[in-house]
């Protein structure tokens, strides 16, 4: 583990309440394929304890879901991936908005540091799948 | 390659027959930049020869399709990546519709045994395009 | 750096004058949170100084756009990540439609070389958004 | 196994209109588009139109303002009507469809309806 | 439109010899990564019978005698060894985009 190969792959708990966007997220190997080796959960929020630079990733497919939903029926639904603590370093990292998709999959590479928490808002009408296959998220680092 | 470096890269050689969803692939320097190094291919599907956890991606465009085929004329068209065999590691790790769209894009960290043969199946009426930048498999071993 | 951990994370800068598609990219820790760790810049293109096996991903999200715009009213947009230079090795390496969508995003492995220059052409007319949660592109060395 | 059966009538007057049934069995509608295709011995063989899975239809530009394609999926029919019909309408008309893909090619065919145009 | 040209319109090949029948289009009809292209065999009172799709796929039950090949406007369709029962008319046909066409046919006879 010294080597710094910090490692996490989450499946979707559950939504926050009400005026909470963010998704909550678990993992670990009685809960199926998820694991976390180095991050940690708080609050079903996935927080960073080694510095570097990480590779992050997510897949979110709305439920019960067909592409008029997301677009005709429903306001616009969205899912950002951000840096939601410290607030000093609160940034938004990854956004992508539904459309007439319900499906939104990318990643992208970011410096992150020890005690960065993530969060992953998704704004709209539609509730995620708790697919483990649908729904996921999961960082890794890749070099210092 | 002690390390555990595997990696592979796939491009489309073909689909199914009638009732076989599977997607069936090649890959190897003579056929473009596709490559297998470590990873094997058993009758075009992708077999793990090392342990550990790996990120599997993939991108799958339909063959003539506008968002009009995808929507509304044709059969609902779905990627699913999973473990075929042995069956008693059969899962589905990976899933997407194209609704919409004509293709798919998704990549997540799994854990892998060696011996585990991965399955990319598409369910619906069109055909993939065989364009290698168009439509590609890969898995990356990251960590033991 | 002798473990050739080459990496970088890029930001939009503008695109190209009428007649080049091509987008043009900007990177460094002053403007936010896009790097070049190894490969380099020129004029706005990235440019490989290390031979291997590359993990390639991007994001590209148009500007005000909603699923209207990407199929009725504008020529169709699409995305194509290439070796561009030298001329020998030209290649489309990963190649998107939006059909109905405002975002494409996607990663694949490929063999890169010590002097490739990759090139991000969007073809259509509709301007790809600069927000850098929006738009990125990165390349990360995975093995020799 | 995949059966297309057509019925329909054999001789039409000029100016009157065709209608034809493609009574399908063993696949779904719900699935699978439908296509028409003619062969006359003065333009050969002719694809006039399809109707999707949805309902929705594309048809030969040439034809589009004479035909009209619809279906009933609970009885497995699709119905071909062609309006205002002159002689070189005169052909064998043909319902045809994919085995797995919904792209134009036939391994499936109705046995064909022979239709003449003549008063 | 595309226009698919066949050619000859008619040939004589004695049995056991090669017939080789060939398909021009107007344009490409390659995307994707395939061909577009799909040969039939039709027999007097018969609807046609596809035999090869999207280029070289051979259709199921077709003897392997049939064997296809070529891209973009270019495709031939090959007989080899010729049979009695090969004496029909054969039509290439493409799938590209809409409306799909047909060539206007090579007659098979035996010598």
């Known amino acids: 583990e010294s080597l710094g190969w910090d490692i996490a792959e989450l499946q979707l708990n559950h939504t926050g309440p009400q005026q909470d966007p963010r998704l909550y997220w678990q993992g670990g190997p009685a809960l199926g394929r998820s694991f976390l080796r180095g991050p940690e959960l708080d609050k079903g929020q996935l927080r960073i304890r080694r510095d570097g630079i990480y590779m992050v990733h997510i897949q979110v497919t709305l439920a019960i879901c067909s592409s008029t939903s997301t677009s005709r029926h429903h306001h616009p639904t969205t899912l950002a991936v951000g840096i939601c603590s410290p607030a000093s370093r609160s940034i938004s990292l990854l956004r992508l908005s539904f459309h007439q998709g319900c499906t939104i999959a990318s990643q992208r590479l970011t410096p992150l540091a020890r005690g960065d928490t993530l969060c992953t808002n998704l704004t709209g009408t539609l509730l995620p799948s708790r697919n483990t296959d649908e729904t996921f998220f999961g960082v890794q680092w890749v070099r210092p | 390659e002690s390390l555990g470096w595997d990696i592979a890269e796939l491009q489309l050689n073909h689909t199914g027959p009638q009732q076989d969803p599977r997607l069936y692939w090649q890959g190897g320097p003579a056929l473009g930049r596709s490559f297998l190094r470590g990873p094997e291919l058993d009758k075009g599907q992708l077999r793990i020869r090392r342990d550990g956890i790996y990120m599997v991606h993939i991108q799958v465009t339909l063959a003539i399709c506008s968002s009009t085929s995808t929507s509304r004329h044709h059969h609902p068209t779905t990627l699913a990546v999973g473990i075929c065999s042995p069956a008693s590691r059969s899962i589905s790790l990976l899933r997407l519709s194209f609704h919409q769209g004509c293709t798919i894009a998704s990549q997540r960290l799994t854990p892998l045994a060696r011996g585990d043969t991965l399955c990319t199946n598409l369910t619906g009426t069109l055909l993939p395009s065989r364009n290698t930048d168009e439509t590609f498999f890969g898995v990356q071993w990251v960590r033991p | 750096e002798s473990l050739g951990w080459d990496i970088a994370e890029l930001q939009l800068n503008h695109t190209g004058p009428q007649q080049d598609p091509r987008l043009y990219w900007q990177g460094g820790p002053a403007l936010g949170r896009s790097f070049l760790r190894g490969p380099e810049l020129d004029k706005g293109q990235l440019r490989i100084r290390r031979d291997g096996i590359y993990m390639v991903h991007i994001q590209v999200t148009l500007a005000i756009c909603s699923s209207t715009s990407t199929s009725r009213h504008h020529h169709p947009t699409t995305l194509a990540v290439g070796i561009c230079s030298p001329a020998s090795r030209s290649i489309s390496l990963l190649r998107l439609s939006f059909h109905q969508g405002c975002t494409i995003a996607s990663q694949r492995l490929t063999p890169l070389a010590r002097g490739d220059t990759l090139c991000t052409n969007l073809t259509g007319t509709l301007l790809p958004s600069r927000n850098t949660d929006e738009t990125f592109f990165g390349v990360q060395w995975v093995r020799p | 196994q995949v059966q297309l059966k057509q019925s329909g009538p054999g001789l039409v007057q000029p100016s009157q209109s065709l209608s034809i049934t493609c009574t399908v069995s063993?696949?779904?509608?719900?699935?699978?588009?439908v296509h028409w295709v003619r062969q006359s011995p003065g333009k050969g063989l002719e694809w006039l139109g399809v109707?999707?899975?949805?309902?929705?239809?594309d048809y030969n530009a040439a034809l589009m303002s004479r035909l009209n394609i619809t279906k009933d999926n609970s009885k497995s029919q699709v119905f071909f009507k062609m309006n205002s019909l002159q002689t070189d309408d005169t052909a064998i008309y043909y319902c045809?469809?994919?085995?797995?893909?919904?792209?134009?090619?036939?391994?499936?065919w109705g046995q064909g309806t022979l239709v003449s145009v003549s008063a | 439109d595309i226009v698919l040209t066949q050619s000859p319109a008619s040939l004589a090949v004695s049995l056991g010899q090669r017939a080789t029948i060939s398909c021009r289009a107007s344009k490409s009809v390659s995307a994707s990564g395939y061909s577009f292209l799909h040969w039939y065999q039709q027999k007097p009172g018969q609807p046609p019978k596809l035999l090869i799709y999207l280029t070289s796929n051979l259709e199921s039950g077709v003897p392997a005698r049939f064997s296809g090949s070529g891209s973009g406007t270019d495709f031939t369709l090959n007989i080899h060894p010729v049979e009695e029962e090969d004496a029909a008319t054969y039509y290439c046909q493409h799938s590209r985009d809409f409306p799909p066409t047909f060539g206007a046919g090579t007659k098979l006879e035996l010598k």
């Open positions: 109707i999707w899975r949805d309902g929705s239809t």
């Open positions: 063993d696949f779904s509608l719900t699935i699978f588009g």
């Open positions: 045809a469809k994919n085995r797995r893909y919904d792209y134009a090619w036939f391994p499936y």
